[in-house]
C-alpha cells in the first residue's frame, strides 16, 4: 500500500498521528472493531502531551481507549509496552470492581470526566477515539 501523508476527512492531525473522535457510544469491542475497519486502532496514549491533546478534544465524557486486560495483563492494542509506558490512572484504579453485578470484573480502560483513567465493564456504551499513524502504509492501493 501507499504511505499515508495526510489525515482523512474529519480526522484531526497531531504529532504525526490522526485522531477521530466519536460522538456516539459503543461497547469496547465494537469500538475496537470500528477503528480497525478504518485502518486504525483505539487511541494509545504514550505521553502526557498526547493525554492532554485527547483530553482537550473529548471533554468531560467517559471515552474508551485502546487499553484492556481481558486476558490477564494490561495490553495496548498496538503492542506498545504497558509496563514501561505512560500511565494516568485515577487513584485506586484500576480496581477490577465486581460490585456492578454484571458478571466478571472490569477489563477495559477509559478516560473519565477529568481525563484520568478508570477500568470499567467492557460492554458499557462509551464514546471512543481512533488513532492512526501518518507515514504508515495504508491498506488502500496507490492512486494512479
Amino acid at each position: 500500500g501507499s504511505e499515508r501523508t495526510c489525515c482523512p476527512v474529519n480526522w484531526v492531525e497531531h504529532e504525526r498521528s490522526c485522531y477521530w473522535f466519536s460522538r456516539s457510544g459503543k461497547a469496547w469491542a465494537d469500538a475496537d472493531n470500528y477503528c480497525r475497519l478504518e485502518d486504525a486502532h483505539l487511541v494509545v496514549v504514550t505521553s502526557w502531551e498526547e493525554q492532554k491533546f485527547v483530553q482537550h478534544h473529548i471533554g468531560p465524557v467517559n471515552t474508551w481507549m485502546g487499553l484492556h486486560d481481558q486476558n490477564g495483563p494490561w495490553k495496548w492494542v498496538d503492542g506498545t509496552d504497558y509496563e514501561t509506558g505512560f500511565k494516568n490512572w485515577r487513584p485506586e484504579q484500576p480496581d477490577d470492581w465486581y460490585g456492578h453485578g454484571l458478571g466478571g470484573g472490569e477489563d477495559c480502560a477509559h478516560f473519565t470526566d477529568d481525563g484520568r483513567w478508570n477500568d470499567d465493564v467492557c460492554q458499557r456504551p462509551y464514546r471512543w477515539v481512533c488513532e492512526t499513524e501518518l507515514d504508515k502504509a495504508s491498506q488502500e492501493p496507490p492512486l494512479l
Epitope: 486486560d69 494490561w74 504497558y82 480496581d95 477490577d96 466478571g104
Partner: antibody, heavy 115, light 107 residues
C-alpha cells in the same frame, strides 16, 4: 519476567497468628488485583482472598472472613495475608496469584496449624 | 456460590492421545473461566483464561472452548510432560471457585 515469591509460612498452634508475604517483580504491581489461594494437603484449590490494585475492593472466602486480613504495599511491591485465630483446617500451601484469572502463581508457602 | 464440577475425575491415556476434560458451572459465567495444570509438589500453572485464550508461552496443543455453563479443555496430542492434574476456575463472581480437578495419568 513476572515473579511472585511467598514467605512467612511455618508451624503454628491452633488459635495462633501468622503473616504471609508475597514479593512481586517483573510487572507493574500497582496495576493488578492480587489473590491468595490455598491448597490443603492432597486436596484441591481454594480461593481465599482478593485485593484490588488500590485497596478499594477486598473480598474473602466465608471460611476465613473475620480471621484473615489481606493487604498490600504498592511502594514495596508486596502482598500480605495476616492470619489470626488459626485452625487445623487452615493447614495448607498458600499461594499468591495475579489477577482474577490467576495468570501467574508463586511457588507457595506451607502453613501448618497443629498442637 | 457458583459450583464447578469436572469430568472425568481421573483418566488414563497414552502418549499421542487426544484428551478432553469437561468443566460445568452451576450457573452461567459467560467466558470467565480459567484452566490450570498442576504437577505434584508444584504450583499451578495457568494454561487458558477467558475460556479460550491461551496463556503466553503455553503450547498450542492446549485449547479451550465453551461459554455460559459448559466448557472443555482439549490436549490435542498428549505428551509425557502433560500427565498432571487439571483444574478449572470461574472468576465471574465472588467467591471465585475451582473445580475438584481431573487427574490425567499414564495408561
Amino acid at each position: 519476567e513476572v515473579q511472585l515469591v511467598e514467605s512467612g509460612g511455618g508451624l503454628v498452634k491452633p488459635g495462633g497468628s501468622l503473616r504471609l508475604s508475597c514479593a512481586a517483580s517483573g510487572f507493574t504491581f500497582s496495576s493488578y488485583k492480587m489473590n491468595w489461594v490455598r491448597q490443603a494437603p492432597g486436596k484441591g484449590l481454594e480461593w481465599v482472598s482478593s485485593i484490588s490494585s488500590g485497596n478499594s475492593s477486598i473480598y474473602y472466602a466465608d471460611s476465613v472472613k473475620g480471621r484473615f486480613t489481606i493487604s498490600r504495599d504498592n511502594a514495596e511491591n508486596s502482598l500480605y495475608l495476616q492470619m489470626n485465630s488459626l485452625r487445623a483446617e487452615d493447614t495448607a500451601v498458600y499461594y499468591c496469584a495475579r489477577v482474577s484469572s490467576n495468570d501467574y502463581w508463586g511457588q507457595g508457602t506451607l502453613v501448618t496449624v497443629s498442637s | 456460590d457458583i459450583q464447578m464440577t469436572q469430568s472425568p475425575s481421573s483418566l488414563s491415556a497414552s502418549v499421542g492421545d487426544r484428551v478432553t476434560i469437561t468443566c460445568r458451572a452451576s450457573q452461567g459465567i459467560s467466558n470467565y473461566l480459567a484452566w490450570f495444570q498442576q504437577k505434584p509438589g508444584k504450583a499451578p500453572k495457568s494454561l487458558i483464561n477467558a475460556a479460550s485464550s491461551l496463556q503466553s508461552g503455553v503450547p498450542s496443543k492446549f485449547s479451550g472452548s465453551g461459554s455460559g455453563t459448559d466448557f472443555t479443555l482439549t490436549i490435542s496430542s498428549l505428551q509425557p510432560e502433560d500427565f498432571a492434574t487439571y483444574y478449572c476456575q470461574q472468576y465471574n463472581s465472588f467467591p471465585f471457585t475451582f473445580g475438584p480437578g481431573t487427574k490425567v495419568d499414564i495408561k
